[in-house]
């Protein structure tokens, strides 16, 4: 939960941030985890810390590996671990994908970039931009700030782009660039009353007293990205969370998926150690957006073991 | 502006449950160095500290009252919840909530409290 | 723990006069340069009301007649010029440690 992947290129800065985080008066202690080492805070070093951030300048190959943050408050220290690589650069155009930040979408009435990670670093305008490595021209494309704006996107706009600027750091200058994939979406989405999908309405769930046991919440939305859309357990008609049995929980975050070009949400209920009370339980699987609310209930019922007798 | 309730049962006998919820706006519990805190003042006494919730789940509790105690949070809804097992008439209180805001970390809001009172 | 032991318990001051209320700690209340060390002022059936955090610095919306300084175990609030009010109950707070504590109080009274 408290690491982060990054990533950068020989003889480019790269500033890290620490995946923990504290508020201005917390003091940041950094360290090379394979040695516990501490990562020195002056300046004239090339790797030095400075507060939550931990900056390469410039990145070396060897410098890959993992480093520890320790974010320390006065009553409680908050450790985290930034997993750092270090590539060689290509000498040809392609950019691998270990070295491309997330995919953006954009459409006809939403068309911006943003440059990845960049307000980590000391920069200056303008950012140059290119696509699969050239350097793009013309009226319709906009740098803006630290992002690109395209003019009329047209499914031809998909592709990788890759932002190039300057860091400073007293006074010397660095070149760091960052790459991600660009795709062209249909704006035609649209929204509907929540259609669960599963479970069925008044299912009855088998479950084995002292086994674990899993529910899906699953529900379609619509088309597109939608504004505001959800999907949740309740137990007896409050949220897991005010329910107050650790061994019934929610999946941390939705999970998102297109199917068929629908946006549909999925909670799964994770139940430890089913016990007999567990069955007198009402599950409600709710799914909600801006067309209003449905409910599906489910019931567990206890599953006989099979007998094994010939 | 930022703002703090508490509410609770206002009565329980000894050995029952204490909950209490804070609800709170004007601020939220996802945003980093935020916290939430539970204090409580009997009739005409001091304050006690009991407990409370950082931005990123981390808990810290009253050692005294640890193994009664239990906080959580429900960020979506801008609530903190503080469950005491076990009442005693020694836990009849004023029980306030507050925000744990600011550089530094002090109670920088505070809502007007709830009584409880623990009787047979 | 962190003791806090305030004096006086109680405080009579003419009007337009100076308070000082002084909190003692246990054991240093200092992390990195800073001395975590709170005051808070609570009227009756009102919950308190924040005045001075980390030792010295004035919450927004305090008047300036109310000043913390100190460091390490000893601190003090003043109200200068002391009025009508600011009859009430003052606490100190350290959030140095866990268990978060607090002083016995001090009652502002005026002569």
């Known amino acids: 939960k408290f690491s982060k992947q990054s990533w950068g290129l020989e003889n480019e800065a790269l500033i890290v941030r620490c995946p923990r985080q504290g508020k201005p008066s917390y003091t940041v202690d950094w360290y090379y985890s394979q040695t516990n080492k501490s990562i020195p805070t002056q300046e004239r070093n090339r790797v030095f810390a400075s507060g939550q951030l931990l900056k390469f300048l410039p990145a070396a190959v060897a410098d890959s590996g993992i480093y520890t943050c320790i974010v320390r408050s006065p009553t409680f220290n908050r450790t985290g671990y930034a997993n750092v690589t270090i590539y060689k650069k290509q000498s040809d155009c392609n950019v691998p994908d270990y070295l491309m930040y997330s995919t953006v979408s954009g459409s006809e009435k939403n068309s911006k970039i943003y440059c990845p990670t960049i307000d980590l670093y000391n920069w200056t305008a303008p950012l140059e931009w290119f696509k699969n490595c050239q350097a793009l021209q013309g009226s319709r494309y906009r740098a803006h700030k630290s992002f690109l704006v395209i003019d009329n996107v047209m499914t031809e706009d998909a592709g990788d782009y890759t932002c190039k600027f300057i860091h400073n750091e007293n006074g010397a200058n660095y070149s760091v660039t960052a790459t991600r994939s660009f795709t062209v979406k249909d704006e035609q989405g649209f929204s509907l009353f929540p259609v669960i999908g599963a479970p069925a309405q008044n299912e009855i769930k088998e479950v084995e007293i002292g086994k674990n046991a899993n529910l899906t919440c699953s529900a379609c939305f619509g088309k597109g990205t939608q504004f505001l859309a959800a999907v949740l357990w309740q137990l007896n008609g409050t949220k897991i969370t005010d329910f107050g049995e650790p061994r019934i929980q929610q999946e941390e975050g939705q999970n998102q998926s297109f199917s068929n070009g629908l946006a549909c949400l999925d909670m799964v209920l994770r139940i430890a150690d089913v016990k007999e009370e567990d069955l007198l339980l009402q599950y409600d699987c709710l799914a909600l957006n801006l067309h209003g609310l449905r409910r599906h209930t489910v019931r567990l019922s206890r599953k006989n073991p099979i007998d094994h007798h010939s | 502006q930022v703002t703090l309730k508490e509410s609770g049962p206002g009565i329980l006998q000894p050995s029952q449950t204490l909950s209490l919820t804070c609800s709170f706006s004007?601020?939220?519990?996802?945003?980093?160095?935020?916290?939430v805190g539970w204090i409580r003042q009997p009739s005409g006494k001091g304050l006690e500290w009991l407990a409370h919730?950082?931005?990123?789940?981390?808990?810290q509790y009253n050692p005294a009252l640890k193994s009664r105690l239990t906080i959580s949070k429900d960020t979506s809804s801008s609530q903190v919840f503080l469950k005491s097992a076990s009442v005693d008439t020694a836990d009849t209180a004023t029980y306030y909530c507050?925000?744990?805001?600011?550089?530094?970390?002090?109670?920088?809001?505070w809502g007007q409290g709830t009584t409880l009172t623990v009787s047979s | 723990d962190i003791v806090l032991t305030q004096s006086p318990a109680s405080l009579a001051v003419s009007l337009g006069q100076r308070a000082t209320i002084s909190c003692r700690a246990s054991?240093?209340?200092?992390?990195?340069?800073?001395?975590?060390m709170q005051w808070y002022q609570q009227k009756p059936g009102q919950p308190p009301k924040l005045l001075i955090y980390?030792?010295?610095n004035v919450e927004s919306g305090v008047p300036a007649r109310f000043s913390g300084s100190g460091s390490g175990t000893d601190f003090s609030l003043n109200i200068h010029p002391v009025e009508e009010d600011d009859i009430a109950m003052y606490f100190c707070?350290?959030?140095?440690?866990?268990?978060?504590?607090f002083g016995g109080g001090t009652k502002l009274e005026i002569k």
């Open positions: 054991e240093s209340v200092e992390y990195s340069g800073t001395s975590l």
């Open positions: 980390v030792a010295s």
């Open positions: 004007g601020f939220s519990l996802s945003t980093s160095g935020m916290g």
């Open positions: 707070q350290q959030s140095r440690k866990v268990p978060w504590t």
């Open positions: 507050a925000r744990i805001g600011g550089d530094y970390d002090y109670f920088d809001f």
């Open positions: 919730i950082w931005w990123d789940d981390v808990k």
